[in-house]
């Protein structure tokens, strides 16, 4: 039985050209996290595997950095980065948990700076 829950940063905003940390946290389960996949809509961004460490998709290597922790840092943001991001936690023995984050990249300095995981 899957008892865990994924907490995410929810809906966040950031300024064009800036950086943002995407963060998810799995709680309420003793399941072992074997791998976390990060996806942007229909693109695999990165994978963090308990044994193999991080793999960043080559097409995102210049703008995606691993961490902190199981999170993902997006750099040099563009308006095209606006959209849904998913953290997919592969666990044993529970199975798969998925969290969703919506990022809005704003043209000007109207981005909110109160987001808990945002880089100033």
């Amino acid at each position: 039985m899957m008892t865990g829950t994924i907490e995410t940063t929810g809906n966040i905003s950031a300024e064009k050209g800036g950086s943002i940390i995407l963060q998810c946290h799995l709680s309420s389960t003793t399941a072992q996290v074997t791998q976390v996949n990060w996806e942007q809509q229909d693109q695999l961004l990165a994978i963090c595997n308990a044994d193999l460490g991080w793999h960043i998709s080559p097409s995102f290597k210049d703008r995606v950095a691993p961490g902190p922790g199981l999170g993902l840092t997006l750099q040099s943001l563009t308006v095209n980065d606006t959209g849904e991001y998913f953290c997919i936690y592969h666990t044993y023995p529970d199975g798969t948990y998925t969290g969703r984050i919506f990022l809005e990249v704003l043209e000007s300095s109207v981005a909110e700076h109160g987001a808990r995981f945002q880089i100033p």
């Epitope: 074997t34 996806e39 994978i47 595997n49 044993y92 023995p93």
Partner: antibody
């Protein structure tokens, strides 16, 4: 250098059993998911079974579920496929493959031929 | 199960030609799509993983694109050693499934 070497294939009668082995070298075997893929003569590729790095999670194609068992011995750097209740349609070359991150098969063995015939 | 449909099943081309092979999934698989090359009597070889990432050591004339349900493998300028059978494979969910293959033959 990464190497995967399958063995254990051969001729077996319908209803019989075989155990295939895949000896791995050149990488940290315990860190990788490993899969078996087969190819019937003149046909395409068919995934058979997979086992994740810890060995706790396994998965099978419907066509072999309940008859085949995938396992691994990380201390011996070896992957296994126990095949029971073999049928003529199981005749194929069986390949083992390394699967980093459970997503792509980056190294394959040379294959071992299993022939099920009376 | 996710079905993978490859087209064409075979094609004839000449050295230097641009060759395109397509693969369609029966449901969205994000970018969990890999391409393999197989020559007669040999094991498959990984060319492209995660839809568009070129495997180390594979010539840059091979490229992959697509996401969701529609994917493409392109060989920009066919070389003599590229005559082979090509397979797509989804790793979005088990059971993992392969396309039926595309045989690239010499015209």
């Amino acid at each position: 250098e990464v190497q995967l070497l399958e063995s254990g294939g051969g001729l077996v009668q319908p209803g019989g059993s075989l155990r295939l082995s895949c000896a791995a070298s050149g990488f940290t075997f315990s860190s990788y998911s490993m899969h078996w893929v087969r190819q019937a003569p003149g046909k395409g590729l068919e995934w058979v079974a997979g086992i994740w790095s810890s060995g706790g999670t396994t998965s099978y194609a419907d066509s072999v579920k309940g008859r085949f068992t995938i396992s691994r011995d990380n201390s011996k750097n070896t992957l296994y496929l126990q095949m029971n209740s073999l049928r003529a349609e199981d005749t194929a070359v069986y390949y083992c493959a390394r699967v980093p991150y459970g997503v792509w098969m980056d190294y394959w063995g040379q294959g071992t031929l299993v022939t099920v015939s009376s | 199960d996710i079905q993978m449909t490859q087209s064409p099943s075979s094609l004839s081309a000449s050295v230097g030609d641009r060759v395109t092979i397509t693969c369609r999934a029966s449901q969205s698989i994000s970018s969990y799509l890999n391409w393999y090359q197989q020559k007669p009597g040999k094991a498959p070889k990984l060319l492209i993983y995660a839809a568009s990432s070129l495997q180390s050591g594979v010539p840059s004339r091979f490229s992959g694109s697509g996401s969701g349900t529609d994917f493409t493998l392109t060989i920009s300028s066919l070389q003599p050693e590229d005559f082979a059978t090509y397979y797509c494979q989804q790793s979005y969910s088990t059971p993992l499934t392969f396309g039926g293959g595309t045989k690239v033959e010499i015209k």
